[in-house]
Every structure is written in structure tokens, then in C-alpha cells.
């Protein structure tokens, strides 16, 4: 019952994340102007990783696509590709661990095989948060590099008599629904490779092994012990594994080097 | 077609108060943003107080902050002008404008309505 | 606060002719997000509530005659009337548009000959 309780609740955390990650990709406030210098502004500023917008107080709002590619900065490329490969990896991971789902049934489908799926899922959901969470985290560093940078040469003017404020831009509110979808999806995948050890029949049957003390000849046999954990599993469909316990899977994250454009 | 009317204007003795009233028709009144601006005898256009569509914004000229309130009731397509603590140079035509066109621009403007502040 | 200063104070000139004034601001009026300049442009004919004539510092309103023509960007902006006609004598003022508050030039009166 816990094992079916973990799966599902995993399963359920992943999705709101993946809904999350999606949401976040799609939103237009990635950065947004930074008000410090001016709170009463009657134009405000805010850039997604498609489109960059701006609000007027008299309620018009205009965005315009970054329809180019190639004139894009390579950082940004590099957020837009993490969270599509996030949102892809999610989708997949849906897609696999509904199938491995211990409520549902599908045919004679062993526990194994959906031991396996859940556990691939659940690797799809780690490595999934994690580029959501890198992508996300990748654009914050961008943002803090860039608001520096302008703070430095915030003001410029004409001898000193007109000043012209350079728009700053701070940390939006996709960022926060990235970060929280991204940890969301990650928990979820966790959930679900716990699940997965739960899920697995594994009976492991240790040898008899013979222990010679000296000055005395007694032998500790233990017997076949079975290890099997698993609410109300088809114990006649059992597969026997020897050679000890399984492992999950390390998820192992290269870092990739981008330029700053 | 949109039109804005004024209305509350009068004499005032100074230290009164006065509520100018704007009622709107002919265009989604609580979609946009509502300006005051107003005109002295003889005198350029000077802009007193801005209330955004939901009333979350709502903004000053430094010569009316503390002394004007300014809100509006979107149901009855109606904006207000609560005026204290009246002076002489508050004496001028009032009118009502939106932003109601791109860039923020006043193209819709009442066809205002007299203050005097007098003794 | 931003400050609008408008020259000449009042032009006079005669019927066909091209006239331009200036509005000057003390801070940029330039908004980097959609490249578009928070200036307006407002025509008060005498006993008339203003009109709106320009937008975005050089953008016509629709129904504004081509004659108008606005142009600047950042601290210095123009308004041209290429062929003046009788109809245009009015007082033209120019507003901030981009910060609170939202500040009106002085104006500048345009009478005929």
C-alpha cells in the first residue's frame, strides 16, 4: 500500500512539475524591470525567453517575438534548451510511468517490467527538474551579471545636466514557478525510484556458508531468506534475483560552458 | 462614441473641499486608466492625479499630494476628485481624460468644469 | 520630477509657411523595451479642450493631418507644421508621458500674421 501511495503521490508531484516547467517556459516575466529607481514608472518592462513585452499604465501591453536565432545572446539559447529538453524528458516520463502505475493493469505485465518503468520515469523526472532548475538558475545568473553591470554605469549624461536612466531588470516571477516546478519534478522522480525498490520482487537467496572456528566444528546455515516487499503482489509471477540488492541509477549532470554574448 | 462629463465644479471659500465627479460612456470604462488635469485662467495644462483600471495605481502632482483623493467606481462608470483643503491656486478648469490610446497618450478629455476658490 | 521645456514660448508666422518648436527634457524619455520614445504632443485651439496630435514622440494620430510631424528622441524633441494654415492657430504642449508625474511643457502659442 505504501509502495502504490509512494508511486502515485510521485507521480502526481512530477505532473504539477512538468505543468510547472511548461508554465514557466511559456511565461513572458522571466526578468522584469527593476522599479528601485524609478517606482512610478508609467512603462514597465518584462522579458520571457520568446517574446519581450511592454506595459503601458493605460493598460496597452505590446510584446514582440525574438524572431531572430542566430542574433539571440547564447546564454539564452542555452535556458531555452535546458527547459525544452526538461519539458521532453517530463512529457516522456508521463507518458512512461503511467503505464507503470500499479493501479492500473495492462495485460500480464510483470512487476518487474513496471519496477523498471517506474524507475526509468523517475530518472526521466530527476534529469528533467534538474535542466529545469539549471535553465532557470543559468537565466538568474545572467540577470545578476547584467543588473551589476548596468548599476556600474547606471547614470549617463550630457555634462552632467540630463540624465538617462538605463532599464535594470530583476528576477521574474517565471524564474520563482521554474525553480519551485523544477524542485516539484525532482522530489517527484525521487519519489518515484523509492517507489521503484518497493515495486521490485526481489528475492534474494544467500548461499549456505559454512564458518570453521577453531577447536570446534559447528556451522551456521542460514536458510533461503526472501526479501520480498511489494502490497499484494502475484507471488506465483516472482522472479528470483540472485547476487544481493539492486541499486538505483546515478543521475549524473555534465556542465556544459556557454559564452556570454 | 466616448464621452466624458464633469461635473461638481462651483465656487469654493479657500480651505474647502469640493468632489468633481467624471461619469464615462461609450468605451469599457474599467479597462482603462483615468487622468485629471487642469487649466488656470490664462494658463498652461497641468496634470493633477492618475488611477489606474482597477484603482491598484493611483499618482499625484506634488502641488495636490496630501490635499486630493482621487478614486472611482467602475459599476456606475464614474471617477472622483475629492478636493480639501482648497486654495486660490487651485482655481481652474478641471478636466477628465483617459489613456484611452497607445503610448499612454490623453485622447479622450471631458469638457472640463470651473473651480473658483475664492473669499 | 521631469521637467518639459518648451521655445519659443509663442511663434507667429504667416499662412504656408514651416514652423517647428522644441520641447526639451530634463531625463530621457526613451524606453529601451520597445524602442519608442513617451512623449505627446497636444494642440488647445482657443476655447477648446486639448487634442490629442502625437504619440510615441512621432507617431500621428489617425485623422491628424500629415502636416504634423513630430520627431526626437531622448532628451530633444520637434513638432513641424509644414504648410501652416489658419486652422492650426492654437497653443501646442508637450507631455512626459514615461514617469509619474506626468508632466506638461509650458507650451508654445502659434499665431498667424
Known amino acids: 500500500m505504501a509502495v502504490t501511495a509512494c508511486q502515485g503521490l510521485g507521480f502526481v508531484v512530477s505532473l504539477i512539475g512538468i505543468a510547472g516547467i511548461i508554465a514557466a517556459t511559456c511565461m513572458d516575466q522571466w526578468s522584469t524591470q527593476d522599479l528601485y529607481n524609478n517606482p512610478v514608472t508609467a512603462v514597465f518592462n518584462y522579458q520571457g525567453l520568446w517574446r519581450s513585452c511592454v506595459r503601458e499604465s493605460s493598460g496597452f501591453t505590446e510584446c514582440r517575438g525574438y524572431f531572430t536565432l542566430l542574433g539571440l545572446p547564447a546564454m539564452l539559447q542555452a535556458v531555452r534548451a535546458l527547459m525544452i529538453v526538461g519539458i521532453v524528458l517530463g512529457a516522456i516520463g508521463l507518458l512512461v510511468s503511467i503505464f507503470a502505475l500499479k493501479c492500473i493493469r495492462i495485460g500480464s505485465m510483470e512487476d518487474s517490467a513496471k519496477a523498471n518503468m517506474t524507475l526509468t520515469s523517475g530518472i526521466m523526472f530527476i534529469v528533467s527538474g534538474l535542466c529545469a532548475i539549471a535553465g532557470v538558475s543559468v537565466f538568474a545568473n545572467m540577470l545578476v551579471t547584467n543588473f551589476w553591470m548596468s548599476t556600474a554605469n547606471m547614470y549617463t549624461g550630457m555634462g552632467g545636466m540630463v540624465q538617462t536612466v538605463q532599464t535594470r531588470y530583476t528576477f521574474g516571477a517565471a524564474l520563482f514557478v521554474g525553480w519551485v516546478a523544477g524542485g516539484l519534478t525532482l522530489i517527484g522522480g525521487v519519489m518515484m525510484c523509492i517507489a521503484c525498490r518497493g515495486l521490485a520482487p526481489e528475492e534474494t537467496n544467500y548461499k549456505a556458508v559454512s564458518y570453521h572456528a577453531s577447536g570446534h566444528s559447528v556451522a551456521y546455515k542460514p536458510g533461503g531468506f526472501k526479501a520480498s516487499t511489494g502490497f499484494g503482489s502475484n507471488t506465483k509471477n516472482k522472479k528470483i534475483y540472485d547476487g544481493g540488492a539492486r541499486t538505483e541509477d546515478e543521475v549524473q549532470s555534465y556542465p556544459s560552458k556557454h559564452d556570454y554574448v | 462614441d466616448v464621452q466624458l462629463v464633469e461635473s461638481g465644479g462651483g465656487l469654493v471659500q479657500p480651505g474647502g473641499s469640493r468632489k468633481l465627479s467624471c461619469a464615462a460612456s461609450?468605451?469599457?470604462?474599467?479597462?482603462?486608466?483615468m487622468h485629471w488635469v487642469r487649466q488656470a485662467p490664462e494658463k498652461g495644462l497641468e496634470w493633477v492625479a492618475y488611477?489606474?483600471?482597477?484603482?491598484?495605481?493611483?499618482y499625484y502632482a506634488d502641488t495636490v499630494k496630501g490635499r486630493f483623493t482621487l478614486s472611482r467606481d467602475n459599476p456606475k462608470n464614474t471617477l472622483f476628485l475629492q478636493m480639501t483643503s482648497l486654495r486660490s491656486e487651485d482655481t481652474a478648469i478641471y478636466y477628465c481624460?483617459?489613456?484611452?490610446?497607445?503610448?499612454?497618450?490623453?485622447?479622450?478629455w471631458g469638457q472640463g468644469t470651473s473651480v473658483t476658490v475664492s473669499s | 520630477d521631469v521637467v518639459l521645456t518648451q521655445s519659443p514660448s509663442s511663434l507667429t508666422v504667416t499662412e504656408g509657411e514651416k514652423v517647428s518648436m522644441s520641447c526639451k527634457s530634463s531625463q530621457s524619455l526613451f524606453n529601451s523595451g520597445n524602442q519608442k520614445n513617451y512623449l505627446t504632443w497636444y494642440q488647445q485651439k482657443p476655447g477648446q479642450t486639448p487634442t490629442l496630435l502625437i504619440y510615441?514622440?512621432?507617431t500621428r494620430k489617425s485623422g491628424v493631418p500629415d502636416r504634423f510631424t513630430g520627431s526626437g528622441s531622448g532628451t530633444d524633441f520637434t513638432l513641424t507644421i509644414n504648410t501652416v494654415q489658419a486652422e492650426d492657430l492654437a497653443v501646442y504642449y508637450c507631455?512626459?508621458?514615461?514617469?509619474?508625474?506626468?508632466?506638461f511643457g509650458a507650451g508654445t502659442k502659434l499665431d498667424l500674421k
Open positions: 507631455q512626459n508621458v514615461y514617469s509619474y508625474p506626468l508632466t
Open positions: 461609450g468605451f469599457t470604462f474599467s479597462s482603462f486608466g
Open positions: 488611477i489606474s483600471s482597477g484603482s491598484g495605481s493611483i
Open positions: 481624460a483617459t489613456s484611452y490610446y497607445y503610448g499612454n497618450a490623453l485622447e479622450y
Open positions: 510615441w514622440a512621432s
